[in-house]
């Protein structure tokens, strides 16, 4: 009889453990933000991209905040950050100002408490996009593991924003917490 009670107690304890694990997982911060194509800056200079979706299509956010074009960390921890930026041009959309392009992405961390800004990751290449080619495409993907503190902000800068691919599966960035800071 006592064996049966112990087994039942273990099952209850186990399910509580699962529930606790699950609720902890559900509280794990993550964000996947996709480009807002209605508000992409023009030109070829380096700009900060401030318009991103956080709640439509593939875009989702939980236990993080998106404000003023920046992804804000709400919990200290080690996070995996990633960004995918696609550049494209088709001749029917106009001409290129120059055939020699520097196509770049910069993932930047800004700290409000100690005002400072650091480039965490950058990627890209110089490209020759001939005016005689009908279509051009180039993709950059960067990712890395970073210690982030509550209140720190992540933002994205790109060169040649007018060449950004506006699709949600092309231009996006995100983060998810992997573990606590010991």
């Amino acid at each position: 009889g006592s064996q049966h009670i112990r087994a039942e107690k273990a099952m209850v304890d186990g399910s509580w453990l699962d529930l606790a694990k699950r609720s902890k997982l559900e509280a794990q911060p993550f964000a996947h933000l996709t480009i807002n194509a209605t508000d992409i800056p023009s030109g070829s200079h380096k700009v900060s991209l401030s318009s991103w979706y956080h709640d439509r299509g593939w875009a989702k956010i939980s236990n993080m905040t998106f404000s003023n074009g920046k992804l804000i960390v709400n919990q200290d921890g080690f996070y995996y950050l990633y960004a995918n930026i696609c550049f494209r041009h088709h001749e029917t959309s106009g001409d290129l100002a120059t055939e020699y392009l520097q196509l770049m992405v910069y993932v930047t961390k800004t700290s409000i408490k100690i005002p400072s800004s650091h480039t965490l990751m950058k990627g890209g290449s110089t490209k020759y996009w001939s005016g005689n080619s009908e279509f051009h495409f180039y993709s950059i993907n960067v990712g890395g593991f970073f210690k982030l503190r509550s209140g720190e902000e992540i933002s994205i800068e790109v060169s040649n924003p007018s060449l950004l691919d506006p699709d949600q599966d092309a231009t996006y960035f995100g983060a998810f917490k992997v573990r606590d800071i010991d």
Epitope: S42, S130, E134
Partner: antibody, heavy 118, light 111 residues
Framework: QVQLQQSGAELASPGASVKLSCKAS????????LQWVKQRPGQGLEWIGA????????KYTQKFKDKATLTADKSASTAYMQLNSLTSEDSAVYYC???????????WGQGTLVTVSA | NIVLTQSPASLSVSLGQRATISCRAS??????????MHWYQQKPGQAPKLLIY???NLESGVPSRFSGSGSRTDFTLTISRVEAEDAATYYC?????????FGGGTKLEIK
């Protein structure tokens, strides 16, 4: 629809300068090269050069490098061509033009006649 | 610079007959699998009008009696059955390479 409206005819003295204008409408002015073409009376077409109005990049045929200066005013969606040190050889109709969505010059201004005469 | 040589310089064709104009480039105007050669029609006192782009593509609104062919250095504009309104000067143009250049023109007269 795409339209290119050019300024009126010019009568100029030898050695003087003229500035021709071309106002674009019906498309985003800063996303296409705007070209200029010369045609002397009874003669063929000559490509002068082009300007990309966004950053103001320019390209010229060698023989027009010292003759023509291309500029653009983004806020007015207007391109300009200044011709300096005018001679009788500069008497011609000057067209501004833009390529089509694929290729080839599909859109032309009505042309500006420049007459150089003492 | 790429030099475009048109022939003949002038052409007289009877109404309903075929007209053929040739344009030869001093070097290839092909790149990325396309031929960057275009054809224009110009009537007196008017701006040129694009007929054919990329060697063989008919511009919207242009009658189907106009056609273009060729690649690399040799190109042809054909009017299958000439009509009275086709009397004009015809120019070829390349934009494969800066500076863009035009042919000297072919004047078509209708008999």
């Amino acid at each position: 629809q795409v339209q290119l409206q050019q300024s009126g005819a010019e009568l100029a003295s030898p050695g003087a300068s003229v500035k021709l204008s071309c106002k674009a409408s019906g498309y985003t002015f800063t996303t296409y090269w705007l070209q200029w073409v010369k045609q002397r009376p009874g003669q063929g077409l000559e490509w002068i050069g082009a300007i990309y109005p966004g950053p103001g990049n320019t390209k010229y045929t060698q023989k027009f490098k010292d003759k023509a200066t291309l500029t653009a005013d983004k806020s007015a969606s207007t391109a300009y061509m200044q011709l300096n040190s005018l001679t009788s050889e500069d008497s011609a109709v000057y067209y501004c033009a833009r390529r089509g969505s694929r290729r080839g010059i599909a859109y032309w201004g009505q042309g500006t006649l420049v007459t150089v005469s003492a | 610079n790429i030099v475009l040589t048109q022939s003949p310089a002038s052409l007289s064709v009877s109404l309903g007959q075929r007209a053929t104009i040739s344009c030869r480039a001093s070097e290839s105007v092909d790149s990325y699998g396309r031929s960057f050669m275009h054809w224009y029609q110009q009537k007196p006192g008017q701006a040129p009008k694009l007929l054919i782009y990329l060697a063989s593509n008919l511009e919207s609104g242009v009658p189907s009696r106009f056609s273009g062919s060729g690649s690399r250095t040799d190109f042809t504009l054909t009017i299958s059955r000439v009509e009275a309104e086709d009397a004009a000067t015809y120019y070829c143009q390349q934009d494969n390479e800066d500076p863009y250049t035009f042919g000297g023109g072919t004047k078509l007269e209708i008999k």
